[in-house]
Interface confidence: low
């Protein structure tokens, strides 16, 4: 691994030589310091590929965490950067150097070398946590094939800076709870699991809290085994709709399938006053189905333009693959246009919607 951004050292950098393997170096840094840990190869010989680990979880390079083969830099350190750091040989996982790092709230003494105007935190924005990128958190159900990498993200802010923890099915979730471990990335707003397996299925909750409050977000992970199964349809879709006469309506259906799915939109109809046939199968008409030039994305949306009262009723999204079928239904209610309501009212009728 190469450092890539070797010159990005700001503020006070305390370079610490690595202890003998087996020893633990105790280090204290001030808030805002640049923590720099050095781990030269034992005996000066070649070291081979290495990984830096904090509290049992592999560190991933970022603009703040600069990872090199023999050196680790953590810029603008905060309390959350306290912990047990080690440099390990990638292949053998042998610990080459081990450091215990504590970051205190008070900045350590020493002049700022980068000339940066450090504005005081006046505490004006003191408050409970909030999501900083809610648009990045809209995917509540993640259905991925086995062996893929999954990332859940909960970018948040608050003052004081909130902490984040992760739960799986309501219980504390840590790296040692799964083979392959987990990665907490970028100020720990993300949880990454590589090479997911069926046992990783479940509900993952990020809990972001400070002394003023707590917010949480739950994601559902489904791992699609290579032994294929019928399509999965996202819960709550399509959703029931109410529309005014003459308006446009869209129904959405999100399909997850390892095997190639075939998607159809159906409308339930009556035949001779009956909604189902003699065998109990509903009467339907196919509104939309795969064609030569239709993409799955297009099929996941059913658009109805200039709706009439005849368009009211039950709609079904049907998805099938080589294994089987899944379907979700929703209802469309069509209301009269406002002018019609007014006219009816003037004529002495009452419309109860």
């Amino acid at each position: 691994e190469s450092l890539g951004t070797e010159q990005r050292v700001v503020g006070r950098a305390a370079e610490v030589p690595g202890p003998e393997p087996g020893q633990q170096e105790q280090l204290v840094f001030g808030s805002g310091d640049a923590v720099e840990l050095s781990c030269p190869p034992p005996g000066g010989g070649p070291m081979g590929p290495t990984v830096w680990v904090k509290d049992g979880t592999g560190l991933v390079p970022s603009e703040r965490v600069l990872v090199g083969p023999q050196r680790l830099q953590v810029l603008n350190a905060s309390h959350e950067d306290s912990g047990a750091y080690s440099c390990r040989q990638r292949l053998t996982q042998r610990v080459l150097c081990h450091f215990s790092v504590r970051v205190t709230d008070a900045p350590s003494s020493g002049d700022d070398e980068d000339g940066e105007d450090e504005a005081e935190d006046t505490g004006v924005d003191t408050g409970a946590p909030y999501w900083t990128r809610p648009e990045r958190m809209d995917k509540k159900l993640l259905a991925v094939p086995a062996a893929n990498t999954v990332r859940f993200r909960c970018p948040a802010a608050g003052n004081p800076t909130p902490s984040i923890s992760w739960l799986k099915n309501g219980r504390e979730f840590r790296g040692e709870h799964r083979i392959g471990g987990i990665k907490l990335r970028h100020q720990q707003w993300s949880l990454v699991m590589e090479s997911v397996v069926p046992s990783d299925r479940g509900n993952y909750t990020c809990v972001v809290e400070n002394k003023f409050g707590s917010i949480r977000q739950t994601y559902t992970l489904d791992v699609l085994e290579r032994s294929p199964h019928r399509p999965i349809l996202q819960a709550g879709l399509p959703a029931n709709q109410t529309a005014v006469l003459g308006s446009d309506v869209e129904f959405h259906c999100k399909v997850y399938s390892d095997a190639q799915p075939h998607i159809q939109w159906l409308k339930h109809v009556e035949v001779n006053g009956s909604k189902v046939g003699p065998d109990g199968t509903p009467y339907v008409t196919v509104l939309k189905t795969a064609g030569a030039n239709t993409t799955d994305k297009e099929l996941e949306v059913l658009s109805l333009h200039n709706v009439t009262f005849e368009d009211a009723g039950e709609y079904t999204c049907l998805a099938g693959n080589s294994i089987g079928f899944s379907h979700h239904s929703a209802w469309l209610v069509v209301l009269p246009a406002e002018e019609e309501l007014v006219e009816a009212d003037e004529a002495g009728s009452v419309y109860a919607g």
């Epitope: 805002g32 991933v60 970022s62 603009e63 603008n76 905060s78 980068d114 000339g115 940066e116 105007d117 450090e118 504005a119 935190d121 006046t122 505490g123 004006v124 924005d125 648009e135 990045r136 809209d138 995917k139 990498t149 990332r151 993200r153 970018p155 802010a157 608050g158 003052n159 004081p160 800076t161 990335r185 970028h186 100020q187 707003w189 993300s190």
Partner: antibody, heavy 120, light 112 residues
Framework: QVQLVQSGAEVKKPGASVKVSCKAS????????IHWVRQAPGQGLEWIGD????????SYAQKFQGRATLTADRSTSTAYMELSSLRSEDTAVYYC?????????????WGQGTLVTVSS | DIVMTQSPDSLAVSLGERATINCKSS????????????LAWYQQKPGQSPKLLIY???TRESGVPDRFSGSGSGTDFTLTISSVQAEDVAVYYC????????FGGGTKVEIK
């Protein structure tokens, strides 16, 4: 060495669509957000939007909402920007650029740019 | 949207002289929790793609000469070239990344 290599120049008629590609190499594609920025002749830089290649999640500048579509193909480490209903004022150099994901960062690498000319 | 306003539009400087470019944001880009200003400066030479010079308002990107420096906090920022060289002829843009992304209009630096 990180590289963002963009597709070649395009000439389009008003009302048409254009799709520009941006192939990333030298780093893990899914560890970054890909942003698109354009620059009309003799003008400044204008942010179009960004995509997280891992989840496909996108953000757009209000001006381009509904007209720009950002996509990414993880298998080829390629990001795409499609702009529809082209007008003459869309004539510009379109750049892809990247930032670290998960938190706002500056744009540290840029593609070479793709000139899109809209003319009848 | 946060609006970024740069001044001046253009600047003619003698070689070796100091050049100062100002950038004002319509709202603060300082995030009090981490005391960072979400502001970057870019350099764009004629016929080239923009290049990142400074991020977090004052941190120089790797490989950028130390004659370039950034300062300021909140809504008012400055890019300073302490001793302008011929290769510094370019358009300079400020950009906020506090809320989505917006750029300033650019400042053209020329040699007198």
């Amino acid at each position: 060495q990180v590289q963002l290599v963009q597709s070649g120049a395009e000439v389009k008629k008003p009302g048409a669509s254009v799709k520009v590609s941006c192939k990333a190499s030298g780093d893990t594609f899914t560890d970054f957000e890909i942003h698109w920025v354009r620059q009309a002749p003799g003008q400044g830089l204008e942010w179009i939007g960004d995509i997280d290649p891992e989840t496909g999640s996108t953000s757009y500048a209000q001006k381009f909402q509904g007209r720009a579509t950002l996509t990414a193909d993880r298998s080829t480490s390629t990001a795409y920007m499609e702009l529809s209903s082209l007008r003459s004022e869309d004539t510009a150099v379109y750049y892809c650029t990247r930032t670290y994901d998960g938190y706002p960062y500056a744009m540290d690498y840029w593609g070479q740019g793709t000139l899109v000319t809209v003319s009848s | 949207d946060i609006v970024m306003t740069q001044s001046p539009d253009s600047l003619a400087v003698s070689l070796g002289e100091r050049a100062t470019i100002n950038c004002k944001s319509s709202q603060s880009v300082l995030y009090s929790n981490n005391n960072k200003n979400y502001l970057a400066w870019y350099q764009q030479k004629p016929g080239q793609s923009p290049k990142l010079l400074i991020y977090w308002a004052s941190t120089r990107e790797s490989g950028v000469p130390d004659r370039f420096s950034g300062s300021g906090s909140g809504t008012d920022f400055t890019l300073t070239i302490s001793s302008v060289q011929a290769e510094d002829v370019a358009v300079y843009y400020c950009q906020q990344y506090y809320s989505y992304r917006t750029f300033g209009g650019g400042t053209k630096v020329e040699i007198k």
